[in-house]
Interface confidence: medium
């Protein structure tokens, strides 16, 4: 766990992520990292005649030399980066104060990093971090050069064979947005058939025309025979 | 904590290499972010360079940005600050220090752990 402390004193603002550093999570998944703290002095007041501070949360993610705060809460609201929006969230606060918590969804390879828990309350801040390591890596698999040639079933076994498993759509999706192309149409763990375009071309629109992003034949009958994609956790 | 052992600091010419070492021992060395900091005489002790735990997250100060790679081997508890294209600015006392915590602009405060530091001088 990683816990760091402003000052020597028992009654300082402290804050900590009771996790072991790095984090080793799976792509397409999502994240809790749990943060807390403790404030022994709340609360913290400017002057009689004002209400208390409230304490102040921030998260940050500090990768490739770039700091990037995700969001801030205070007082009950959470404002979140926008580029974030739909991506990162606090499930505990503010129904539990002390709780900052960060939920990440649907992780990316560039979502690695180092994540910040920053609580500020007056003049006093804290903060803990915790090293995330995206794994897994999506790739397209074809039997020997021949398309689609693979049912639903031989279409597993043909990941287990490459020492990986079948892709979820959440993986696919991952990958895509890490910047996957393939104009392939492969099987995926819940029986969909999709493939992930960037620059949509003839032969490659689905059911998405000129638009980017990951093509669905939806659920398809097992014996349908089409490509693969698998999942690994390591390439060697 | 951890004990931090540095060397492989000398004498080298502007242009040229060396490669610091910095030897942990004690528990759980890959828990550590690690850093390279460095004094001139008369000046601050100023942030070289931070990895994080796996290593895989690195940051730099500008001025050794592109010239100086850090790295580390936890099987071998230790971590490495490669230094090429010297300039006789980079005259100092390099110490190597151990903290749980990890920015984009680290300061001393964020390390619990120091080694005695090791002498890099460059000439003209």
């Known amino acids: 766990a990683v816990t760091v402390e402003t000052s020597d004193h028992d009654n300082s603002l402290s804050v900590s992520i009771p996790q072991p550093s790095p984090l080793r999570v799976l792509l397409g998944t999502s994240l809790t990292i749990p943060c807390y703290f403790i404030d022994p002095m709340h609360p913290v007041t400017t002057a009689p005649s004002t209400a208390p501070l409230a304490p102040r949360i921030k998260w940050s993610r500090v990768s490739k030399e770039k700091e990037v705060v995700l969001l801030v809460a205070t007082e009950g609201r959470v404002r979140v980066n926008s580029a974030y929006q739909d991506k990162v969230s606090l499930p505990n606060y503010p129904a539990i104060p002390s709780d900052a918590t960060l939920e990440v969804q649907s992780l990316r390879s560039n979502d690695s990093g180092v994540y910040r828990c920053e609580v500020m309350h007056g003049i006093e801040d804290s903060e803990a971090t915790l090293e995330v390591v995206v794994k897994g890596i999506v790739f397209h698999y074809r039997a020997i050069s021949t398309r689609y040639t693979l049912d639903f079933d031989r279409a597993q076994r043909a990941c287990l064979q490459n020492s990986a498993i079948i892709a979820t759509p959440e993986q696919l999706q991952a990958a895509y947005e890490d910047g996957f192309h393939q104009c392939d149409a492969g099987w995926l763990a819940d029986q969909t058939v999709r493939y992930p375009i960037h620059t949509p071309r003839e032969g490659c629109y689905g059911d998405k025309d000129e638009f980017p992003g990951v093509r669905t034949y939806g659920i398809r009958d097992t014996n349908e025979t089409y490509d693969v994609y698998c999942f690994a956790e390591e390439m060697e | 904590e951890v004990q931090l052992v540095e060397s492989g600091g000398g004498l080298v010419q502007a242009g040229g290499s060396l490669r610091l070492s910095c030897a942990a021992s004690g528990r759980s060395f890959s828990s550590y972010a690690m850093g390279w900091f460095r004094q001139a005489p008369g000046k601050e002790r100023e942030f070289v360079s931070i990895?994080?735990?796996?290593?895989?997250?690195?940051v730099y100060a500008d001025s050794v940005k592109g010239r100086f790679t850090i790295s580390r081997d936890n099987a071998k508890n230790t971590v490495y600050l490669q230094m090429n294209s010297l300039k006789p600015e980079d005259t100092a006392i390099y110490y190597c220090?151990?903290?749980?915590?990890?920015?984009?602009?680290?300061?001393?405060?964020?390390?619990?752990?120091w080694g005695q530091g090791t002498q890099v001088t460059v000439s003209s």
């Open positions: 220090a151990a903290g749980r915590l990890y920015r984009a602009t680290p300061r001393p405060a964020d390390f619990g752990s």
């Open positions: 990895i994080s735990w796996s290593g895989g997250s690195t």
